[in-house]
């Protein structure tokens, strides 16, 4: 009886793993083996595919074959017993085009209210992605184990930190890789779970802001407790994209090591032009906080994005605020050559209840005020460009009293 050729051959490539699967065309015939040949583009001869000769099952692995992954190849298969079937030719394919990105390797670290995720490609020194290793980005899905409500985070790099979590809570997540340059989306990693720690005695510093004063940067932050010492560290932001060895060499800012106030001042020339990450940690001598959230600090923008200067004209039920260009040292106005929006915060002097107005215009009305009442106003500028997404620090608060009734005209 003539043997039939195997049918429905599927080629699965995940990272550097090349797997072939096929269907037996005749289940009734026992002790059949299968063999593959391959042919490279531009070649006439067929070569035996090592790892896929005389196979008794309907699956084989030809990962050991050192192929040029960008070169088209053709495969053929036949069945063998005493005689052989005719060859069945598989459509030619380019391994790189066909390849899927495998699940990445994931390691987790826990803090009390944060999780650090370290991600690396599932196949070390992959041949398939050798030219693209630096281009991987990742996305993840995270959920509280108890609730299952998922949150997606896109476009992250090989180390990512998720903040604002709850202490002593188990979070689960899965991660997949993408090569946006090749329109490839990978498969998810297995689910990894980790429990955040008990709440730390010392919270991390919050609300870190950088401003420019004369030739110095002024770094300010908020802290819950008094009598603390703080240290500030910096890192080149581009290193976060580097899938290298997961060791980020954060550096001390010398003037911000063991400072006893919630601010520190250091010369602008500490940083060359570039984008940096900054973080702050608190210590009381016995205990140390976890690091604050990292803030992005762009020397180019920071140097120019100063808090706005404004004048207030007081009426009985409103303030008219006129925003002008900020002044540098020497009282010269700064030319801001990119569009800004202004955030104006005002409050009654005797109250903590703040109200906020966001405006693109440089003349702003603050309505619904009470007559003969002292209100305080502060403002800051934001860049409108999403990529830059920078904010100045708030200006100093200016307090004014509204006029007596009926002066709104």
């Amino acid at each position: 009886k003539n043997l039939k050729s195997p049918q429905k051959v599927e080629v699965d490539i995940i990272d550097d793993n090349f797997i072939l699967r096929w269907n037996r065309s005749d289940e009734s015939v026992g002790n059949v083996t299968f063999s593959f040949d391959y042919q490279k583009t531009g070649m006439d001869n067929w070569i035996k595919l090592s790892g896929c000769q005389n196979i008794t099952s309907t699956k084989c692995n030809f990962s050991s074959l050192k192929l040029n992954v960008y070169e088209e190849i053709k495969l053929r298969i036949r069945a063998e017993k005493e005689n052989t079937s005719s060859w069945y030719e598989v459509d030619s394919f380019t391994p790189f085009r066909k390849a899927q990105i495998g699940p990445p390797e994931v390691h987790l670290e826990a803090e009390d209210k944060a999780i650090v995720i370290h991600i690396s490609p599932g196949t070390k020194d992959s041949v398939m992605w050798a030219l693209d290793g630096l281009s991987f980005t990742y996305s993840l899905v995270i959920w509280k184990n108890s609730s299952g409500v998922e949150e997606r985070i896109e476009n992250i790099y090989s180390r990512h930190k998720i903040y604002k979590l709850s202490p002593e809570t188990t979070y689960c997540l899965k991660v997949k890789a993408a090569l946006l340059t090749s329109w490839k989306i990978g498969v998810y990693s297995p689910v990894h779970c980790i429990k955040t720690t008990v709440e730390n005695e010392l919270p991390p510093p919050e609300n870190i802001e950088v401003s420019v004063q004369n030739q110095n940067y002024v770094l300010k932050w908020d802290y819950t407790y008094a009598n603390m010492t703080f240290q500030v560290q910096w890192l080149h932001a581009f290193l976060k994209r580097n899938p290298g060895n997961h060791l980020y060499k954060w550096k001390q800012i010398p003037d911000c090591e063991n400072v006893k106030t919630t601010q520190c001042v250091f010369p602008q020339n500490v940083f060359q032009k570039g984008i940096y990450l900054l973080r702050v940690q608190a210590s009381d001598g016995n205990n140390t906080s976890f690091w604050s959230e990292e803030i992005k600090f762009d020397t180019e923008i920071q140097a120019f994005l100063l808090p706005p200067v404004f004048n207030i004209r007081s009426l009985s039920d409103s303030f008219h605020i006129y925003i002008g260009a900020p002044k540098q040292s020497g009282n010269t106005p700064v030319i801001q050559d990119y569009p800004l929006i202004y955030e104006i915060i005002f409050w009654e002097n005797t109250s903590n209840a703040e109200r906020k107005i966001i405006e693109k215009k440089t003349d702003v009305t603050v309505p619904n005020l009470k007559p003969l009442t002292v209100y305080c106003v502060k403002a800051r500028a934001h860049t409108m460009d999403e990529k830059l997404n920078k904010s100045s620090v708030f200006s100093d608060a200016v307090c004014e009293k509204t006029k007596p009734g009926n002066t709104s005209k």
Partner: antibody
Amino acid sequence: QVQLVQSGAEVKKPGASVKVSCKASGFNIKDYYIHWVRQAPGQGLEWMGRIDPEDAETKYAPKFQGRVTMTADTSISTAYMELSRLRSDDTVVYYCARYHGYWALDYWGQGTLVTVSS
Amino acid sequence: DIQMTQSPSSLSTSVGDRVTVTCKTSQNVGTNVAWYQQKPGKAPKPLIYSTSYRYSGVPSRFSGSGSGTDFTLTISSVQPEDFATYYCHQYFSYPYTFGPGTKLDIK
């Protein structure tokens, strides 16, 4: 493969200095920190400090501050630990180790015994 | 400085037994704890990093758990080559510190 090979045993007099070397191979020393840990006979491990070979930034344990100097020569992939004003209780084994972020101290040298004796 | 205590300080056990060593830190160190095994005259051998991850080549009978201030090293079935001293190590903040060690010997 990754290796840290330390210099040989030394005998020193009290008050003298000793300089122990740690030669790295199988990785770029600039990409990691090199830590130094010591161990007295029959005792536990004691962290002395670390150096970033890329820019020579150091952190020392307060106990050794002022007496220890860590340096590195990246051209020959070697880190050094010098301890001055030696006392008899500095008779210990000194280890160098590679620090790899959350992987901690993932490779160690074989250790160097320094004996301080008059 | 972050203090580290380990218990027990020594432990006599038999091949095949399950052994647990605990380590306490004087403050929350997240999951920045590693474990090392040391045999006489040898350098420490890394076993566990980041609380629960085994280094490559470390047998699966070794496992780590915990977070915050309480950490555990477990050997599920002690083998003859496991008789050694075990150290925990915090690398959360400088100066880094080690536990005093737990000596595992044959009963």
